[in-house]
């Protein structure tokens, strides 16, 4: 059974992930972002189901494409270089979902824009955090 300290650690990691995703979304939605039109043409894949930490595998598999999209944006829109930002997110996601269990992600048929994709995972983080608090 999860201890209160492990639950607290999970909560903090989810909050960190949530802030990173919100920062990316804010940077993309910046009205000065000249690459937004092109960024919105990138197709992202959404999970059929995202209710547990293991489902973060679906986010992890989209972090490569996410990094490529962020490479299009002006660096001043973000505090970190895309490579460093994605690297940080990968570490958090790996700690949250674990590396031992190999979960195969199932994707929804419909693709999403980067904005829809980020909003989906922001909602996921908020949902899990609310169950922990």
């Amino acid at each position: 059974a999860p201890t209160s300290s492990s639950t607290k650690k999970t909560q903090l990691q989810l909050e960190h992930l949530l802030l990173d995703l919100q920062m990316i979304l804010n940077g993309i939605n910046n009205y000065k972002n000249p690459k937004l039109t092109r960024m919105l043409t990138f197709k992202f894949y959404m999970p059929k189901k995202a209710t547990e930490l293991k489902h973060l595998q679906c986010l992890e598999e989209e972090l490569g494409p996410l990094e490529e999209v962020l490479n299009l944006a002006q660096s001043k829109n973000f505090h970190l270089r895309p490579r460093d930002l994605i690297s940080n997110i990968r570490v958090i996601v790996l700690e949250l979902k674990g590396s031992e269990t190999t979960f195969m992600c199932e994707y929804a048929d419909e693709t999403a824009t980067i904005v829809e994709f980020l909003n989906r995972w922001i909602t996921f983080c908020q949902s899990i955090i609310s169950t922990l608090t």
Epitope: R38, T41, F42, Y45, E61, P65, E68, L72, S99, M104
Partner: antibody, heavy 123, light 107 residues
Framework: QVQLVQSGAEVKKPGATVKISCKVS????????MHWVRQAPGQGLEWIGR????????KYAENFKGRVTITADTSTDTAYMELSSLRSEDTAVYYC????????????????WGQGTLVTVSS | DIVLTQSPATLSLSPGERATLSCQAS??????LSWYQQKPGQAPRLLIY???SLASGIPARFSGSRSGTDFTLTISSLEPEDFAVYYC?????????FGQGTKLEIK
């Protein structure tokens, strides 16, 4: 169906420069990140680098930095790979290949390949 | 750089047999791994992407699996046209790296 057609074989002297082309047909080049991979005779595959033709941003493998230049001409849907200061170890078949984030998940991998260009470096 | 180690270097089997090719990553790469088949004088051909997904037009006898940083390409029943060199590739981070290849030859 997307097709990549590369320029013909080249024979170069050590110290020279070679420039290989890769023409995309069946789609516009700006839909793809154009990558270059090489294969020395009887050896494995080695990633050289890539270009995003839409904004000309490039990424190169450390081994090739300073010697390789990847460019793209969107008006002709053609990518180029130029390798300078050639040495005998650069004798290889050079392939162009693609990645795109606009279509299916499968096309995020090296799904389309050129036929390869043999570059021979010999004195 | 991420190193991919393929084994065995050469695999000698007969048509109809099952082939199991291994690729081990030097660090965690999630499912960012693909498999390619290459025949002499030809460009590589994508077989498997995202560790387990079958590329379009590839026969169902090919399958991919993953356990941690160990990846496996399985050919359930070898056909004569399957004898070739197979490479794994990681897309987790640049520089993208390939395994050294496994040559599948007729016994």
């Amino acid at each position: 169906q997307v097709q990549l057609v590369q320029s013909g074989a080249e024979v170069k002297k050590p110290g020279a420069t070679v420039k290989i082309s890769c023409k995309v047909s069946g789609d516009t080049i700006t839909a793809y990140y154009m990558h270059w991979v090489r294969q020395a005779p009887g050896q494995g595959l080695e990633w050289i680098g890539r270009i995003d033709p839409d904004d000309d941003s490039t990424k190169y493998a450390e081994n090739f930095k300073g010697r390789v230049t990847i460019t793209a001409d969107t008006s002709t849907d053609t990518a180029y790979m130029e390798l300078s200061s050639l040495r005998s170890e650069d004798t290889a078949v050079y392939y162009c290949t693609t990645i795109t984030f606009y279509y299916t998940r499968e096309l995020r991998w090296f799904a389309y390949w050129g036929q390869g260009t043999l570059v021979t470096v010999s004195s | 750089d991420i190193v991919l180690t393929q084994s065995p270097a050469t695999l000698s089997l007969s048509p109809g047999e099952r082939a199991t090719l291994s690729c081990q990553a030097s660090q965690y790469i999630s499912n960012y791994l693909s498999w390619y088949q290459q025949k002499p004088g030809q460009a590589p051909r994508l077989l498997i992407y995202s560790a387990t997904s079958l590329a379009s037009g590839i026969p169902a006898r090919f399958s991919g699996s993953r356990s941690g940083t160990d990846f496996t390409l399985t050919i359930s029943s070898l056909e004569p046209e399957d004898f070739a060199v197979y490479y794994c590739l990681q897309h987790y981070s640049t520089p993208y790296t390939f395994g050294q290849g496994t040559k599948l030859e007729i016994k």
